[in-house]
Interface confidence: low
């Protein structure tokens, strides 16, 4: 984990005046000047009443304010004389001492209170040296760290009990540990005090660093009893337009000319072709003039443009229909979603003075008029002897983004005379034993002047056809058999030739015994 911070509550190392701690009895611990291992002047306490048995010498520090800390650490530096190196001493010589503390809400202690004994003082530990020394050695300094808690009052005293050692207390430092403010996973966690126990885990809530966003919540880090961070929960990541820097402690804006479309730990990338950024922290690069992105294009894709016009439009006119064919545009604009639209305009008037307007809705385009993928269309139901302009537009996924209309190639054509369309309906006006009088509506699209009509009829049971011609849109068929069913079809003729026959219609003659011509209702084709 991250290195722990230690904050000092009290340290004798930096005190050069008298410590003036309380000792009991007065013949026990004694304050003297000395030097630490770096030869700095320090105040120490010594005791060496080894020649007398039943020693019980206490030393108490001044009041130490707690500062909301729950667990306190004490670092002791001391030397202890080896009992075996001291001649003529009783067996009560010790090489250990005891560490205690006492909590209070203010500096209430006196020479006699609290009583100099375990309870009210709370024992922390018996402190033994790693090395003791003989008279011939230089004093070997031992360092021990002990901790205690949880603390709840405003402050505390430390106390040291000697029971017959020859020792020197060189320095005492009371401190607490905290986890230093840190950045992890693009989140910032504040300085956090350790908990009451060495095993405590204190939760520190996190906040995303600038230009980062949460990717999993909650954001928290645990501060353990040693002042080290552990078990990160949740994470942040760099926002769009920002890339990681300084070992995940910063999210740096993308420099101009680069972008980052997605949040995450990826780097900023150079702008795709035909795009740019002019300011930092771009999540998308804006397209150059006349270049665009379709709504379905990702921010990572290049900007593209509209296609150039289709090339080589060829028309093949057949009476009132035609086939248009063309080639792919020279420039597809960098896209592969090319489509074609065919715009039909009917022109009136002669030469350059002609005015053109949109074609009627009945003009038919096969396979369709708009959104063609193929480069061919069949157009029918045009008017005869009429001038038309057809515009073949090339469009792609960004044509809708362009302020300009699609680019097109145009072709002008004039339709030929077409044969008339089919005669729609036949009506029976009267019938007798030997005749039928019929009429019909002219074709919907005569496509010119109708010269005459040709009627084909036959008796249904025989199937041998006869034809008659009429310049009117009615005819009387004579010389028919009574009580017979006839099948009749009519077609119109213009200078362009005959049109299609009408659908077959059936009519009956009456019996010869019937009185005169019988008026029948109109019969529609079956």
């Amino acid at each position: 984990g991250c290195r722990a911070l230690e904050e000092t509550l009290m340290d004798t190392k930096w005190v050069t005046s008298e410590l003036a701690w309380t000792s009991h009895p007065e013949s026990g611990w004694e304050e003297v000047s000395g030097y630490d291992e770096a030869m700095n002047p320090i105040r120490t306490y010594q005791v060496c009443n080894v020649r007398e048995s039943s020693q019980n010498n206490w030393l108490r520090t001044g009041f130490i304010w707690r500062r909301d800390v729950q667990r306190v650490y004490v670092e002791l530096k001391f030397t202890v004389r080896d009992c075996n190196s001291i001649p003529n001493i009783p067996g009560s010589c010790k090489e250990t001492f005891n560490l205690f503390y006492y909590e209070a809400d203010s500096d209430v202690a006196s020479a006699s209170s609290p009583f100099w004994m375990e309870n009210p003082y709370v024992k922390v530990d018996t402190i033994a040296p790693d090395e003791s020394f003989s008279r011939l050695d230089a004093g070997r300094v031992n360092t021990k760290v002990r901790s205690f808690g949880p603390l709840s009052k405003a402050g505390f005293y430390l106390a040291f009990q000697d029971q017959g050692a020859c020792m020197s207390l060189i320095s005492v430092r009371a401190f607490y540990k905290k986890c230093a403010s840190t950045t992890a996973g693009f989140a910032l966690f504040p300085e956090t005090l350790t908990g009451a126990e060495p095993t405590s885990l204190v939760i520190a809530p996190g906040t995303c660093i600038p230009n980062a966003v949460e990717v999993s919540v909650p954001l928290k880090l645990y501060c353990n009893g040693d002042g080290e961070w552990m078990v990160p929960v949740g994470a942040c990541t760099c926002a769009t337009g920002h890339e990681p820097a300084a070992k995940e402690s910063q999210c740096r804006p993308c420099p101009p000319g680069s972008y980052k479309a997605k949040q995450g730990e990826g780097p900023c990338l150079p702008c795709p072709p035909n795009s740019r950024t002019t300011s930092p922290a771009a999540s998308i690069c804006t397209c150059h003039n006349n270049f665009y992105r379709a709504d379905s294009d990702s921010a990572d894709s290049a900007c593209t443009t509209v296609p150039s016009p289709p090339r080589g439009v060829i028309s093949n006119v057949n009476e009132t229909s035609l086939i248009l064919e063309w080639s792919e545009p020279r420039d597809l604009g960098g896209r592969d979603d090319l489509l074609y639209n065919v715009i039909c305009k009917k022109c009136h008037g002669a030469g350059g003075a002609s005015a053109c307007s949109r074609c009627d809705d009945n003009v038919e385009f096969v396979p369709r008029q708009l959104g063609l993928t193929e480069r061919r269309v069949h157009i029918s139901h045009l008017l005869a002897h009429t001038r038309y302009t057809f515009e073949v537009q090339a469009v792609n996924g960004v044509s809708g983004k362009s302020p300009l209309p699609p680019r097109y190639a145009a072709v002008n054509i004039t339709t030929n005379q077409a044969a008339p369309s089919e005669v729609p309906t036949l009506r029976l006006h009267s019938s007798s034993g030997s005749s039928l009088t019929l009429s019909w509506a002219p074709p919907e699209r005569p496509n010119g002047v109708i010269l005459d009509y040709e009627m084909k009829y036959f008796e249904k049971s025989e199937g041998i056809a006869s034809t008659v011609t009429s310049q009117m849109n009615s005819v009387q068929l004579d010389g028919l058999r009574p009580d017979a069913r006839y099948v009749v079809q009519v077609r119109a003729r213009t200078v362009a030739g005959y049109g299609q026959y009408s659908r077959p219609a059936e009519f009956e003659t009456t019996s010869e015994r019937g009185s005169g011509a019988q008026q029948l209702q109109e019969q529609l084709p079956l």
């Epitope: 072709p273 894709s301 593209t304």
Partner: antibody, heavy 113, light 108 residues
Framework: QVQVQQPGAELVKPGASVKLSCRAS????????MHWVKQRPGQGLEWIGN????????NYNEKFKSKATLTVDKSSNTAYMQLSSLTSEDSAVYYC??????WGQGTTLTVSS | EIVLTQSPTTMAASPGEKITITCSAS???????LHWYQQKPGFSPKLLIY???NLASGVPARFSGSGSGTSYSLTIGTMEAEDVATYYC?????????FGAGTKLELK
């Protein structure tokens, strides 16, 4: 570790077609254009074109427009380049490369009868 | 099409020498779109410097790039034996993307 994998070599006859593959792993395939680059023996680098793996959109160097067709298969994280009507001039190492700076090892194409 | 002209075409240098390769564009390009590649024989090109002056990941600090408009350069502060390679500049300003013809750097 980002990897862009290409087959080592292809041997084809003149007039035939070949489809070179380029498989990308361990990064978002659809996030970056896939570029194709040609290098003739002892020569420099020529950009053929690129393809957008997210929608199949392409850009071509005019010089290679009738020679190369670029496609992608998103399901397998693979980009393809089809080269048609092959001649000895098409014998080269073909690299695929993805932004930002990941290159395949190249496929050596030999056109020979 | 933007044409990139590199010079010199080939050069030989001793270890410790300072090397400069130039790349001239036929029309002005943004410094964000000029990149340098290193290619060793038998290997694919490796991105060396992107956006004119940014070192790609893992590239030694002896390499540096600079330039603007139509004039760009790649510098090797102190040549090392492992720098023997062909160096290409590349523009990404407009399609088609183009490369310089390359500068072959040899050991003297």
């Amino acid at each position: 570790q980002v990897q862009v994998q290409q087959p080592g070599a292809e041997l084809v006859k003149p007039g035939a077609s070949v489809k070179l593959s380029c498989r990308a792993s361990d990064y978002t395939f659809t996030s970056y254009w896939m570029h194709w680059v040609k290098q003739r023996p002892g020569q420099g680098l020529e950009w053929i074109g690129n393809v957008n793996p997210s929608n199949g959109g392409t850009n071509y160097n005019e010089k290679f427009k009738s020679k190369a067709t670029l496609t992608v298969d998103k399901s397998s994280n693979t980009a393809y380049m089809q080269l048609s009507s092959l001649t000895s001039e098409d014998s080269a190492v073909y690299y695929c490369a993805s932004n930002p700076g990941y290159w395949g090892q190249g496929t050596t194409l030999t056109v020979s009868s | 099409e933007i044409v990139l002209t590199q010079s010199p075409t080939t050069m030989a240098a001793s270890p410790g020498e300072k090397i400069t390769i130039t790349c001239s564009a036929s029309s002005s390009i943004s410094s964000n779109y000029l990149h340098w590649y290193q290619q060793k024989p038998g290997f694919s090109p490796k991105l060396l410097i992107y956006r004119t002056s940014n070192l790609a990941s893992g590239v030694p600090a002896r390499f540096s790039g600079s330039g603007s408009g139509t004039s760009y350069s790649l510098t090797i502060g102190t040549m090392e034996a492992e720098d023997v390679a062909t160096y290409y500049c590349q523009q990404g300003s407009s399609i088609p993307l183009t490369f310089g013809a390359g500068t072959k750097l040899e050991l003297k």
